[in-house]
């Protein structure tokens, strides 16, 4: 939010030199008027009258929804996740029909033992959440299951999850190579068939703050951009202060139009200001520039 600039006159001049008589209204903004009942409201840009005031659509605000906000709320998820569809073959358990029934005691016991085994296998992966058996079938026991991974959202979340999926692959390959039957017996919690380990599919949460920002900015999409602060994305226009992309209007007010951000320069009793950034001051009485 911008601080109001104390001025002694009310005229604002655009950087091109024309005087703007109604500074709060962007004359280049398309105007649509909403009429509800017999209340003719000046709700522009798709806004509607709720009986008391204009309810504005993003990215507009103001009494008549005539102004464009400087920042748009974008809310990335707190956590992001990945799901890996894996198949392993357990050789230390013989398949029985009861294992087909997910509500049977046999299935529950197998699920518990398998989960314990996988928790041991993936214990060093901070992103690891757990496993979920989707299907058991003959051979000895072919276990189709999902490995679930989760991490806090950061701009680098995809890299973190990609790295975690690689470690999962390495660890499951290692355990299914090492924990194998010897003389028809298994000394481990579970033994595996080395050749039965397959990664079928990997699904990673898709979240793109730039895309969300552009969508919400609508016709201003080319002028809103994403900047990060404390690993959190902000969808801002150049009129939002405090960011790398912020436009410095010096002696003026930043205003969004459909052609982008521009500075509306102020005129005081003693000076008028001009230039693209309102940084050229001319003293009214002496007519010389202060740079």
């Amino acid at each position: 939010p911008l601080a109001t600039i104390p001025v002694s006159t009310t005229s604002l001049t655009s950087s091109e030199g024309s005087t703007i008589s109604t500074p709060s209204v962007d004359i280049s903004t398309p105007v649509t008027t909403s009429i509800v009942g017999d209340q003719c409201s000046r709700c522009k840009n798709g806004g509607f009258w709720d009986g008391l005031k204009c309810q504005c659509l993003t990215p507009y605000y103001g009494e008549s929804c005539e102004e464009v906000v400087n920042s748009i709320d974008i809310a990335p998820p707190e956590t992001v996740s990945a799901q890996m569809e894996l198949t392993v073959t357990v050789t230390s358990v013989k398949f029985t029909d009861e294992l087909k029934n997910h509500s049977s005691q046999e299935f529950r016991e197998f699920n518990k033992t398998f989960t314990e085994q996988m928790n041991i296998v993936y214990s060093g992966i901070p992103e690891y959440v757990g496993v979920n058996i989707t299907n058991l079938r003959l051979g000895s026991v072919v276990v189709e299951h999902d490995v679930l991974l989760r991490t806090k959202y950061t701009p680098e979340y995809k890299t973190a999850l990609d790295n975690a999926t690689e470690v999962v692959k390495q660890k499951i390959t290692k355990v299914t190579t090492e924990q194998i039957m010897t003389n028809d017996n298994c000394s481990a919690l579970m033994c595996f068939n080395t050749t039965g380990t397959q990664v079928q599919n990997i699904t990673v949460t898709q979240y793109d703050p730039v895309e969300e920002c552009r969508q919400k900015a609508e016709e201003y999409e080319d002028y809103f951009l994403v900047e990060y602060r404390d690993q959190k994305p902000y969808c801002i226009s150049p009129c939002e202060s405090g960011f790398n992309a912020s436009k410095n209007c010096n002696h003026g007010k930043c205003q969004m139009s459909q052609n982008g951000a521009r500075c509306l320069c102020v005129t005081t009793e003693t000076h008028w200001y001009s230039g693209e950034d309102c940084n050229q001051g001319t003293q009214k009485s002496h007519h010389h520039h202060h740079h």
Partner: nanobody, 123 residues
């Protein structure tokens, strides 16, 4: 609720015999796997033998030819016949069970356990 109760332990001289029994209640003895484990003082629990629902058996190398595991499905019972006992067979013997057809003597794979019966082989 599955309950396993062992009996038959005691003091026996080296070279002697003992028969351990395990009565299983709440466990469908015609299914899954039943096993005997033992734990000697100051040592880890080790698998002695297991038997599957179809009668398939497996033994630890140290007891092969001396011990015999069997189960009576009609009586819901598991047995361990121990012959030619040695001092190193001294331990608490545990009965364990799983509803799954297991081929492992890893104790963590068995969810159901008895309280154990003490076997002492000493002259």
């Amino acid at each position: 609720e599955v309950q396993l109760v062992e009996s038959g332990g005691g003091l026996v001289q080296p070279g002697g015999s003992l028969r351990l029994s395990c009565a299983a209640s709440g466990f469908p003895s015609s299914r899954g796997t039943m096993a005997w484990f033992r734990q000697a003082p100051g040592k880890e629990r080790e698998g002695v033998a297991f038997i599957n629902s179809d009668g398939r058996t497996s033994y630890a190398e140290s007891v092969k030819g001396r011990f015999t595991i069997s189960r009576d499905n009609a009586k819901n019972s598991l047995y361990l016949q121990m012959n030619s006992l040695r001092a190193e067979d001294t331990a608490v013997y545990y009965c364990a069970a799983s509803l799954l057809y297991l081929m492992t003597v890893n104790a963590a794979a068995y969810p159901y356990w008895g309280q154990g019966t003490m076997v002492t082989v000493s002259s």
